[in-house]
C-alpha cells in the first residue's frame, strides 16, 4: 500500500465539512519523486488539496470538503500514471442525520398469541444504518419508580414494531415502554408510554350469525332483521360494549353506526331498514367500561330484509 | 377484601330441589362474572355454571344441564344455584367463586355441602 | 371439550425440594391456563393465571410457563406451607375444565 487515507469523520452531518488526509509512503520509489496527489469524490476531482513533503519524506495532501452533500460517497487519493489515475486508497464516506425521536408509540395486547405488541413511527430518513430498540420495564406504580427491566426487543430491519412475549409481561401491573433510536450520528427516545397491558387489549369480534326462526317467536316484520352473534370465547369473561354497522349491497350507501350494545344481547333485532333489500352486516367490540382497543370488525354477514305486507286495492270494473 | 359466603347446602333426597345462595362484599359485584364449582368427597374441582355479569350468559355443565339454573341479583349482591332433579352424584362441596377477566377464579367461598340421599 | 391431564397425580418431596407439575391441554389453549392450591377442608387458592402471572400476594417460589398444550408449575424450593393439592384449570373455552390434582406429599 502506498497510500493511505484518514479523515476527521467517515459519518457526518448531511452538509457538514470533512476533512481529509493521504499521505504517500517514502519507500514507493517507482513512484515520481514529487508526485502530485490528487483527490476524488465519486466520479468527480476535487480541487484545493493542500501538499506537502513531511520530514520523514513521505507526502501529505489535506482536503476539507465544505460540504459533504452526498449521503454516501467515495472519497479516494490517487496519482496521475501514465495516462491513467492511480488510486492509492480510498474511504467511504456516509451523511445523513441523527434519529428523529420516534412518535406514536402505542401498544396492543393480543391474547391468543400472549404477546404485547407495539408499534410507532419512526420519523424522517437518516440516510444512515439506524437502529430502534423497544426498551421497558415493570413497575408497581405510575412508572415514576423503575422495576425490573425487561429484556430488549428488537425489530426485524425495516420494521417499525416488536413483540413483548408474555413471559416478560405482567397483567394488571403498569409497564414503562419507550423506543430509543441510534446511528452513528446521535440516539433519540420517544416519549414514554405507562400501561397496564390488558388496558390495550385487543379481542377478537363475535361472530354474525342469522337468528335461527323459532316456531313461536314471530318472523321479523318489514325492514327489519334478526340476526345473533356469537361471542369470542377466549374473551368472554370481559365486559364488552359492541356496536353493529349495516349498508345496503347495492348503491354507494355508507355504513350506519347502531350501538352501543352489550356484548350479553347476544340477539338484536335491526329495525328501520329498506324493506326486500341486501344488506351487509359487521360487528366489533371493545373492553368496557375498563380500557381497551375497538375490535376489528367480524366477517360480513349478508342478510334480506322481508317484503312489504302486501295491501289491498279495490278495483272497479266497467262493463 | 374480597368475600364471599355461600348458604343453604343440607341433606336432600334424590329427585329434592335445594337453592344455593352466595352472597358477596368487598368488590363490584356487577362487574364481574360469578361461578359455582363443586367438589365431591374425595375428589377433585369440577365447574358446574357460570354467569355474566349482567346476567345474560349463562353456560352450563353438561352434568347438570336442564337441572340447574345460575342466577345473580346485583341489587342485592348476590349469586344463586337453583338445583332441580338432585342426584347422588351431585353429593359435593359447592364453591361459590368470583371470575377474572381471563378466567381465572380470582375468589372463593368457603364452601356449603350438598349431600342427596335417601 | 378440552381434557386437562395432569402429572404426576402425587409426589413426596422434601422442604427446600424443588418440585414441578406439568398440566397437558388436549388441544391448544394459548395462554389461558390457571393454578390453584388446595389444603384438606378448605377452599382452593388462586396461584397462576394466564400461564405465568403470579396472583398478588402469592410468594415468588411459585412460577408457571408454557403455552398452547404443555404447561408447569413449579415450585422453586418446597416449603412447609406447600404441601398441598394443585389443581390446572383451562378457562380459553367453554366448558372449563380443571386437571385431576397433584398432590405433594411429605417424603
Known amino acids: 500500500e502506498c497510500g493511505h487515507i484518514s479523515v476527521s469523520a467517515p459519518i457526518v452531518h448531511l452538509g457538514d465539512p470533512i476533512t481529509a488526509s493521504c499521505i504517500i509512503k517514502q519507500n514507493c520509489s517507482h513512484l515520481d519523486p514529487e508526485p502530485q496527489i490528487l483527490w476524488r469524490l465519486g466520479a468527480e476531482l476535487q480541487p484545493g488539496g493542500r501538499q506537502q513533503r513531511l520530514s520523514d519524506g513521505t507526502q501529505e495532501s489535506i482536503i476539507t470538503l465544505p460540504h459533504l452533500n452526498h449521503t454516501q460517497a467515495f472519497l479516494s487519493c490517487a496519482l496521475n500514471w501514465g495516462n491513467s489515475l492511480q488510486i492509492l486508497d480510498q474511504v467511504e464516506l456516509r451523511a445523513g442525520y441523527p434519529p428523529a425521536i420516534p412518535h406514536n408509540l402505542s401498544c396492543l395486547m393480543n391474547l391468543t398469541t400472549s404477546s404485547l405488541i407495539c408499534q410507532w413511527e419512526p420519523g424522517p430518513e437518516t440516510h444512515l444504518p439506524t437502529s430502534f430498540t423497544l426498551k421497558s420495564f415493570k413497575s408497581r406504580g405510575n412508572c415514576q419508580t423503575q422495576g425490573d427491566s425487561i429484556l430488549d426487543c428488537v425489530p426485524k430491519d425495516g420494521q417499525s414494531h416488536c413483540s413483548i412475549p408474555r413471559k416478560h409481561l405482567l397483567l394488571y401491573q403498569n409497564m414503562g415502554i419507550w423506543v430509543q433510536a441510534e446511528n452513528a450520528l446521535g440516539t433519540s427516545m420517544s416519549p414514554q408510554l405507562c400501561l397496564d397491558p390488558m388496558d390495550v387489549v385487543k379481542l377478537e369480534p363475535p361472530m354474525l350469525r342469522t337468528m335461527d326462526p323459532s316456531p313461536e317467536a314471530a318472523p321479523p316484520q318489514a325492514g327489519c332483521l334478526q340476526l345473533s352473534w356469537e361471542p369470542w370465547q377466549p374473551g368472554l369473561h370481559i365486559n364488552q360494549k359492541c356496536e353493529l354497522r349495516h349498508k345496503p349491497q347495492r348503491g354507494e350507501a355508507s355504513w350506519a353506526l347502531v350501538g352501543p350494545l352489550p356484548l350479553e344481547a347476544l340477539q338484536y333485532e335491526l329495525c328501520g331498514l329498506l324493506p326486500a333489500t341486501a344488506y351487509t352486516l359487521q360487528i366489533r367490540c371493545i373492553r368496557w367500561p375498563l380500557p381497551g382497543h375497538w375490535s376489528d370488525w367480524s366477517p360480513s354477514l349478508e342478510l334480506r330484509t322481508t317484503e312489504r305486507a302486501p295491501t289491498h286495492h279495490h278495483h272497479h270494473h266497467h262493463h | 377484601e374480597v368475600q364471599l359466603l355461600e348458604s343453604g347446602g343440607g341433606l336432600v333426597q334424590p329427585g329434592g330441589s335445594l337453592r344455593l345462595s352466595c352472597a358477596a362484599s368487598g368488590f363490584t359485584f356487577s362487574l364481574y362474572w360469578m361461578g359455582w364449582v363443586r367438589q365431591a368427597p374425595g375428589k377433585g374441582l369440577e365447574w358446574v355454571s357460570s354467569i355474566s355479569s349482567s346476567g345474560g350468559v349463562t353456560p352450563y355443565a353438561d352434568s347438570v344441564k336442564g337441572r340447574f339454573t345460575i342466577s345473580r341479583d346485583n341489587s342485592k349482591n348476590t349469586l344463586y344455584l337453583q338445583m332441580n332433579s338432585l342426584r347422588a352424584e351431585d353429593t359435593a362441596v359447592y364453591y361459590c367463586?368470583?371470575?377474572?377477566?381471563?378466567?381465572?377464579?380470582?375468589?372463593w367461598g368457603q364452601g356449603t355441602l350438598v349431600t342427596v340421599s335417601s | 371439550d378440552i381434557q386437562m391431564t395432569q402429572s404426576p397425580s402425587s409426589l413426596s418431596a422434601s422442604v427446600g425440594d424443588r418440585v414441578t407439575i406439568t398440566c397437558r391441554a388436549s388441544?391448544?389453549?394459548?395462554?389461558?391456563l390457571n393454578w390453584y392450591q388446595q389444603k384438606p377442608g378448605k377452599a382452593p387458592k388462586l396461584l397462576i393465571y394466564y400461564a405465568s402471572n403470579l396472583q398478588n400476594g402469592v410468594p415468588s417460589r411459585f412460577s408457571g410457563s408454557g403455552s398452547g398444550t404443555d404447561f408447569t408449575l413449579t415450585i422453586s424450593s418446597l416449603q412447609p406451607e406447600d404441601f398441598a393439592t394443585y389443581y390446572c384449570?383451562?378457562?380459553?373455552?367453554?366448558?372449563?375444565?380443571f386437571g385431576g390434582g397433584t398432590k405433594v406429599e411429605i417424603k
Open positions: 388441544q391448544g389453549i394459548s395462554s389461558y
Open positions: 367463586a368470583k371470575l377474572g377477566e381471563l378466567g381465572q377464579y380470582m375468589g
Open positions: 384449570q383451562q378457562s380459553m373455552w367453554m366448558p372449563i375444565f
